[in-house]
């Protein structure tokens, strides 16, 4: 006899990186017929939702109107059908950004390079932090970690046209509290025409949408929650 129901999916909209004082929605998708969903934060009950009518709803949304450092951390959700509870979802790491200061991002030898050249990004922040994160804008949401007292190096090695795109960095005060993003640095990689056609630039978003951290489209999120969970886990672990 089944003792628990399948685990639900959990994700954040528009993104798991949330600027402080901005809003975020945590979504939990379970099964039709679930009479109650519970959202847990760092092991404690955070919120409850009882969908109506339960037989027509398989997803609930928990709204956080004012993100702050107290709400940054790990979330999971469970749901109940009758008296039977589900397994807990994977953990969602919710990150608060725009804390304290803004790092400076630079690139060596420069923002315009030839395919095959070695490129290194440098992220500098003079306040007390030792972990830095380099993100490439676009759906793939590439993330690298670096460490250093006031500056971290991010060697990309010999680059290809696939490395083209816009990069930003963050200083991290802990796993779930990040600085303001740096100003963007656009890396241009020139190569032969054949390479370029085989490795087009990642789709990126215009600079004014970066503030919402829409690195993944909403439809993309809904299509593959597991991938989204996996991306967030890898970033923070």
């Amino acid at each position: 006899q089944q003792q628990t129901l399948p685990k639900p999916f959990i994700w954040a909209e528009p993104h798991f990186m949330v600027p402080k004082e901005k809003q975020v929605t945590i979504c939990c998708q379970g099964n039709y017929g679930a009479v109650e969903y519970q959202l847990h934060f760092e092991g404690s009950l955070f919120a409850v939702d009882r969908p109506k009518p339960p037989e027509r709803i398989n997803k609930v949304k928990f709204y956080i109107p004012d993100m702050n450092s107290r709400m940054a951390g790990q979330y999971s959700c469970i749901y109940r059908v009758g008296e039977l509870w589900s397994e807990p979802s994977n953990l969602l790491d919710l990150v608060v950004t725009e804390m304290y200061d803004t790092p400076t991002l630079s690139v060596h030898p420069g923002p315009e390079v030839i395919s095959g050249e070695k490129v290194t990004f440098y992220c500098r922040l003079d306040t007390a932090t030792s972990m830095f994160l380099l993100l490439k804008e676009g759906r793939s949401s590439h993330v690298q970690r670096g460490y250093g007292k006031v500056q971290a190096e991010f060697p990309l090695g010999p680059v290809t046209t696939a490395h083209r795109g816009t990069y930003r960095c963050f200083g991290s005060y802990n796993n779930h509290a990040w600085s303001f993003p740096s100003e963007p640095v656009k890396l241009l990689v020139t190569g032969d025409i054949e390479n370029t056609s085989l490795a087009p630039e990642d789709p990126t978003f215009p600079a004014d949408t970066w503030g919402t951290y829409l690195l993944t489209t909403e439809t993309g999120l809904q299509k593959d929650h597991a991938l989204w969970d996996h991306t967030a886990q890898n970033l923070l672990r």
Epitope: S44, L45, K52, Y63
Partner: nanobody, 126 residues
Framework: EVQLVESGGGEVQPGGSLRLSCAAS????????MGWFRQAPGKEREFVAA???????YYADSVKGRFTISRDNAKNTVYLQMSSLRAEDTAVYYC????????????????????WGQGTLVTVKP
Amino acid sequence: EVQLVESGGGEVQPGGSLRLSCAASGRTFASAAMGWFRQAPGKEREFVAAISRSDDTYYADSVKGRFTISRDNAKNTVYLQMSSLRAEDTAVYYCAAVVPTYGNNIYVHSAAYNYWGQGTLVTVKP
């Protein structure tokens, strides 16, 4: 901006009843999820009860069956009816709001609340 003002606190004997009120200013009350928390001397603030925009409720185990939370959107007020009071219910009671929110969301964790009242003292003693 939402302002919350609690009233109804006072001294009561064990087994007695009190009704706390929390009046909210502004037009956003109907879009708010509301909650009651309490803090006893020398202890951390703890969850008591909460109510969603759609009147769903949730209670701490310690008050279940004794306390009832309700709201009156026409009066911009949330209530906490407390009965069968015990000495361990002695605390400062705080009203809190999450504004805005979805209809069925009930918030249990204090971190979720973005507006707080100043509190009203409830003392239960013989």
